[in-house]
Amino acid sequence: MSITGISPITEYLASLSTYNDQSITFALEDESYEIYVEDLKKDEKKDKVLLSYYESQHPSNESGDGVDGKMLMVTLSPTKDFWLHANNKEHSVELHKSEKPLPDQAFFVLHNMHSNSVSFESKTDPGVFIGVKDNHLALIKVDSSENLSTENILFKLSETHHHHHH
């Protein structure tokens, strides 16, 4: 899977929540960021994430559609210079400071269940998705026989009118 352009085709500012309407939040602790999945109080402000969309070609052996075989890849950045990364060895999702060009671990294939319900598949480990485990984000293997609608890998994107804090 190769990214076809250096620049994102679009960027989208959203808050991220689970299928069960828990919010994904980010907290700076001891000079590193922690990611939490939690219920927010009624008027508590949701954290915002900058989703950058990139086009990517299917590997040629995977798709018979030539130039048509495109996917959407996303990177997720909750704050300046930090991006969500897949740690495939630890099956964890972590926030790391990175410089562009971003490593492959920062890219996720976007799957839509509907326009505001999405899943994020690790670019570096196909079949493994960002999911919720014990109130944290983790990498979860989804068998091809399973329906991707399994709730713990589904996330909702809700629009926000605030500016990203980049």
Epitope: E62, S63, G64, L110, N112, S115, S149
Partner: antibody, heavy 121, light 106 residues
């Protein structure tokens, strides 16, 4: 080359049924969302129904809910639209269309030539 | 449901003119918008996706812009072969088409 070929249109009486088929080629069918979009004579485009790549999620225009059913057979590269209890206002050219990106409902890139459905007594 | 409103309904311009078509959404659609061209008797053809990305094979005189609720398709120098109806299409929340703008040559 991407090709989408719709069949099954024709003249049908109100209250009757019709099943449209769309055979796809030139791309990995099972990776893509598929759509039915219609256009009444001389009018604009109207989204009718969508189905995700594995067929597990389907969506409908309110006015066709409960009457139309979208389905797909990934082994045969075909998407269907079963239309029951047809009304005169369903008269339109029905287009089959393909999602722009694998696994994604964002954007539509290729369309078939359409099949005309006329509902009239 | 999101409504899409295109203006004008009909646009008449001369060959070589710069032409601007408008599409307004009833809610913020976050740049999740395509533009299609439909010539008489033909299926629609994708011109622009995600607001401002030119589809492969489409002439560079076509461009798109916008954000939030307001979007624009521009033809920098109108050609006779551009006579068609142009539709915007949002996919941010469900799927909705605008009613179309018919472009004619004066």
């Amino acid at each position: 080359e991407v090709q989408l070929v719709e069949t099954g249109g024709g003249l049908v009486q109100p209250g009757r049924s019709l099943k449209l088929s769309c055979v796809a080629s030139g791309f990995t069918f099972s990776n893509y969302w598929m759509y039915w979009i219609r256009q009444a004579p001389g009018m604009g485009l109207e989204w009718v129904s969508s189905i995700n790549n594995d067929g597990g999620n389907t969506y409908y225009l309110d006015s066709v809910k409960g009457r139309f059913t979208i389905s797909r057979n990934n082994a045969e590269n075909t998407v269907y639209l079963q239309m029951n209890s047809l009304r005169s206002e369903d008269t339109a050219t029905y287009y089959c269309a393909k999602g722009h990106y694998s696994y994604s409902s964002y954007s539509i890139d290729y369309w078939g030539q359409g099949t005309l459905v006329t509902v009239s007594s | 449901d999101i409504q899409m409103t295109q203006s004008p309904s009909v646009l008449s311009a001369s060959v070589g003119d710069r032409v601007t078509l408008s599409c307004k959404a009833s809610h913020n659609i976050n740049k999740h918008l395509d533009w299609y061209q439909q010539k008489v008797g033909e299926a629609p053809k994708l011109l622009i996706y995600f607001t401002n990305n030119l589809q492969t094979g489409i002439p560079s005189r076509f461009s798109g812009s916008g954000s939030g609720t307001d979007y624009t398709l521009t033809i920098s120098s109108l050609q006779p072969e551009d006579v068609a109806t142009y539709f915007c299409f949002q996919y941010n929340s469900g799927w909705t088409f605008g009613q179309g703008t018919k472009v004619e040559i004066k």
